[in-house]
């Protein structure tokens, strides 16, 4: 039994880091493998992660972590029984993938303005709470070419756009994702999308 693709890990910088790897053949990850991880810190001890299958030869492990700070470094040991298959390390602050925003809502009752709001996925005491910026994706269900991205570079989890920038009388969907420049993170996954029917009063034509 050998590791074909070494584990790569990403952290949500809150409580979970996810590590994925591939074996050289079909593997029952949960019964055959264990990933041991330990914070390089005086008052720490090893934790064991039981991996799950992620395709025939793929495995994934969700490492539980508390109070991540920038200096944190973890040792990782991948075991198959008594055999050490791979040894490595992981610094969560250098591999951050933020949590996806939630509760995306489109408010259509504000005089020809669309107000999109969503929830910051972090609690106020987490460092990323005040460092997220967002991208909002809006697209038409009827016209695949009608697809747009709005970058929200301020901290408030909301976006206002004029309803007239979208076509009237058709349905649109929106979703939002987040990233943090401070840790040069990757983008989060997209939030679940929400749907609304766009309608607004055309202004009277001037003659």
């Amino acid at each position: 039994m050998k590791v074909l693709q070494e584990p790569t890990c990403v952290s949500d910088y809150m409580s979970i880091s996810t590590c994925e790897w591939k074996m050289n053949g079909p593997t029952n990850c949960s019964t055959e493998l264990r990933l041991l991880y330990q914070l390089v810190f005086l008052l720490s001890e090893a934790h064991t992660c039981i991996p799950e299958n992620n395709g025939g030869a793929g495995c994934v492990c969700h490492l539980l972590m508390d109070d991540v700070v920038s200096a944190d470094n973890y040792t990782l040991d991948l075991w198959a029984g008594q055999q050490l298959l791979w040894k490595g390390s992981f610094k969560p602050s250098e591999h951050v993938k933020p949590r996806a925003p939630g509760n995306l809502t489109v408010h259509t009752n504000v005089s020809d303005t669309l107000l999109l709001t969503w929830s910051n996925p972090y609690p106020p005491d987490n460092y990323l709470y005040n460092h997220l910026t967002y991208a909002v994706n809006i697209w038409s269900e009827n016209d695949p070419a009608d697809f747009r991205i709005y970058n929200v570079t301020y901290l408030e989890p909301s976006l206002r756009i004029a309803a007239s920038t979208l076509k009237s009388g058709i349905s649109y969907r929106a979703r939002v994702r987040a990233w943090a420049q401070c840790y040069n993170t990757t983008w989060s996954e997209w939030s679940p999308s929400t749907k609304w029917h766009n309608s607004y009063r055309e202004p009277f034509e001037q003659h």
Epitope: S44, E45, Y127
Partner: antibody, heavy 116, light 110 residues
């Protein structure tokens, strides 16, 4: 709300013993390392001892090694400090603190006075 | 003698900016994060800055921390009378296998 409540302090003669307790609430106690920090009257802070979340890793300041024992009971959400062979210089307010790279929550402290 | 060195006292007038330094070595500050604690008279210490420069929720943004090499500093801008307290820096020291504090700095608001 995180709360740490120390108890067990008091007056003790040199050479005597005392056991301090720290009752924790408002967080998952068994997930976190804990420490004892003390402060002699009019002096600065001194870290005394720390223990990892599952008792697997324990450290002491040189000044208390061999005399003090830190322990915890995760089922009772309680941290302990057994202090033996106490000396006058151990007189201080003893704080327990939730521990990581830093001490993010502190108790209000319990006063230990070692005097004849 | 503390492992981390802080000035014993500092002072400033309301509205001023005050900086407190903390000097260590490669076995503590140089390879670990620095924290700062505020101790108001007659109370337990409180975490003010962690991970060198991060503020816990509830700590005003007048307080800021920084680290460079084996030294760290705490800056307080727009000084207020309620900032009068003792301030301690701290870091884990891997050669001592212990957490080490600075001797503390007594801040007086004139």
């Amino acid at each position: 709300e995180v709360q740490l409540l120390e108890s067990g302090g008091g007056l003790v003669q040199p050479g005597g013993s005392l056991r301090l307790s720290c009752a924790a609430s408002g967080f998952t106690f068994s997930n976190y390392a804990m420490s004892w920090v003390r402060q002699a009257p009019g002096k600065g802070l001194e870290w005394v001892s720390g223990i990892s979340h599952g008792n697997g890793s324990i450290y002491y300041a040189d000044s208390v090694k061999g005399r003090f024992t830190i322990s915890r009971d995760n089922s009772k959400n309680t941290l302990y400090l057994q202090m033996n062979s106490l000396r006058a210089e151990d007189t201080a307010v003893y704080y327990c603190a939730k521990t990581g790279r830093h001490f993010d929550y502190w108790g209000q402290g319990t006063l230990v006075t070692v005097s004849s | 003698q503390s492992v981390l060195t802080q000035p014993p006292s500092a002072s400033g007038t309301p509205g001023q900016r005050v900086t407190i330094s903390c000097t260590g070595s490669s076995s503590n500050i140089g390879n670990n994060t620095v924290s700062w604690y505020q101790q108001l008279p007659g109370t337990a210490p409180k975490l003010l800055i962690y991970d060198n420069s991060h503020r816990p929720s509830g700590v005003p943004d007048r307080f800021s921390g920084s680290k460079s090499g084996t030294s760290a500093s705490l800056a307080i801008s727009g000084l207020q009378s309620e900032d009068e307290a003792d301030y301690y820096c701290g870091s884990w020291d891997y050669s001592l296998s212990a957490y080490v504090f600075g001797g503390g700095t007594k801040l007086t608001v004139l």
